[in-house]
């Protein structure tokens, strides 16, 4: 069966939107009015993995681009990257683990935990226009909580 996907945008708990500022550069900043059109639309695919009531494995692709968020160990540190894939083969139900995030819902907020690196989360900085990254701490300076807005396909 084909993998089930939905289109959405994400904003962090400070209401910063995610935008592409270059081919491999995902940054978080406040947008208003017409500029909201700049925000990235994700194709969130529901993939194979450990699942529970509040934890759902997903892959986050960029709509109409052959790019996925992935988590790799780079110089001994879990690192978030935008990775090019062959569009003929993606998305698929059984995604490689580096592409899988556990979407965790807590108090109407979402966290995206790396399946490859437990307790590492998609994070944004407090500062404006900084890259989205993989962070190993929750509840500190960096932001790990997001809200999701559905986008019609």
């Amino acid at each position: 069966a084909p993998v089930r996907s939905l289109n959405c945008t994400l904003r962090d708990s400070q209401q910063k939107s995610l935008v592409m500022s270059g081919p491999y550069e995902l940054k978080a900043l406040h947008l208003q009015g017409q500029d909201m059109e700049q925000q990235v639309v994700f194709s969130m695919s529901f993939v194979q993995g450990e699942e529970s009531n509040d934890k759902i494995p997903v892959a986050l692709g960029l709509k109409e681009k052959n790019l996925y968020l992935s988590c790799v160990l780079k110089d001994d540190k879990p690192t978030l990257q935008l990775e090019s894939v062959d569009p003929k083969n993606y998305p698929k139900k059984k995604m490689e683990k580096r592409f899988v995030f556990n979407k965790i819902e807590i108090n109407n907020k979402l966290e995206f935990e790396s399946a490859q690196f437990p307790n590492w989360y998609i994070s944004t900085s407090q500062a404006e226009n900084m890259p989205v990254f993989l962070g190993g701490t929750k509840g500190g300076q960096d932001i790990t909580d997001f809200t999701m807005q559905f986008v019609s396909s």
């Epitope: 081919p23 992935s70 780079k74 690192t79 990257q81 990775e83 890259p131």
Partner: antibody, heavy 116, light 112 residues
Framework: EVQLVESGGGLVQPGGSLRLSCAAS????????MSWVRQAPGKGPEWVSG????????GYADSVKGRFTISRDNAKNTLYLQMNSLKPEDTAVYYC?????????WGQGTQVTVSS | QAVVTQEPSLSVSPGGTVTLTCGLS?????????PGWFQQTPGQAPRTLIY???NRHSGVPSRFSGSISGNKAALTITGAQPEDEADYYC????????????FGGGTHLTVL
């Protein structure tokens, strides 16, 4: 303040190799894509190569594809360019730059001269 | 490989407005090309003016603005100053599988 310091250039014979390094400071290196750009004497800049944060996606100008390899060491805040099978037309000042599209104050670069 | 085209030279009077363009030999420029604009004066390294179509780099005067107009990227200088006399280069990301970026040949701007 963003600082990028290139090194490793020099005079090399055609067919030879060089490895350029770029030491980065003043920003969180591991969260940015990086690139190399070069400029030959009297010519405009030429984008050479780019690499994403984790090193899993790279890109190369057609003129260097198969001869140059970009890499990075996030623990050392350093970007590299391994240049093999060098040609006289690779002679240029080589700059490293923050972001894939080189959106940064550029450093002073390192001179590479390929000549017999 | 696609060629990035720019006007070889343009001139503007001090205080005047001038628009430099950046096109593709095949097809239209879109935001997916992440157009960037760079300024270079003799003996200096290039300096980033605009990235990602219309974002001014820090410290760049507000008289410089970027846009996409028709099928090209554009750099507009409103109220040109003598110190704006320089070479201007654009760069475009080639998203059609080649995964690289290409600079244009540059425009020499004279302010007289």
């Amino acid at each position: 303040e963003v600082q990028l310091v290139e090194s490793g250039g020099g005079l090399v014979q055609p067919g030879g190799s060089l490895r350029l390094s770029c030491a980065a400071s003043g920003f969180t290196f591991s969260t940015y894509a990086m690139s190399w750009v070069r400029q030959a004497p009297g010519k405009g800049p030429e984008w050479v190569s780019g690499i994403n944060t984790g090193g899993g996606s790279t890109g190369y100008a057609d003129s260097v594809k198969g001869r140059f390899t970009i890499s990075r060491d996030n623990a050392k805040n350093t970007l590299y360019l391994q240049m093999n099978s060098l040609k006289p037309e690779d002679t240029a000042v080589y700059y490293c730059a923050k972001d894939w599209m080189a959106t940064t104050p550029w450093g002073q670069g390192t001179q590479v001269t390929v000549s017999s | 490989q696609a060629v990035v085209t720019q006007e070889p030279s343009l001139s503007v009077s001090p205080g005047g407005t001038v628009t430099l363009t950046c096109g593709l030999s095949s097809g239209s420029v879109t935001t997916n090309n992440y157009p960037g604009w760079f300024q270079q004066t003799p003996g200096q390294a290039p300096r980033t003016l605009i990235y990602n179509t219309n974002n001014r780099h820090s410290g760049v005067p507000s008289r410089f603005s970027g846009s996409i107009s028709g099928n090209k990227a554009a750099l507009t200088i409103t109220g040109a100053q003598p110190e704006d006399e320089a070479d201007y280069y654009c760069a475009l990301y080639m998203s059609s599988g080649s995964n690289n970026a290409v600079f244009g040949g540059g425009t020499h701007l004279t302010v007289l």
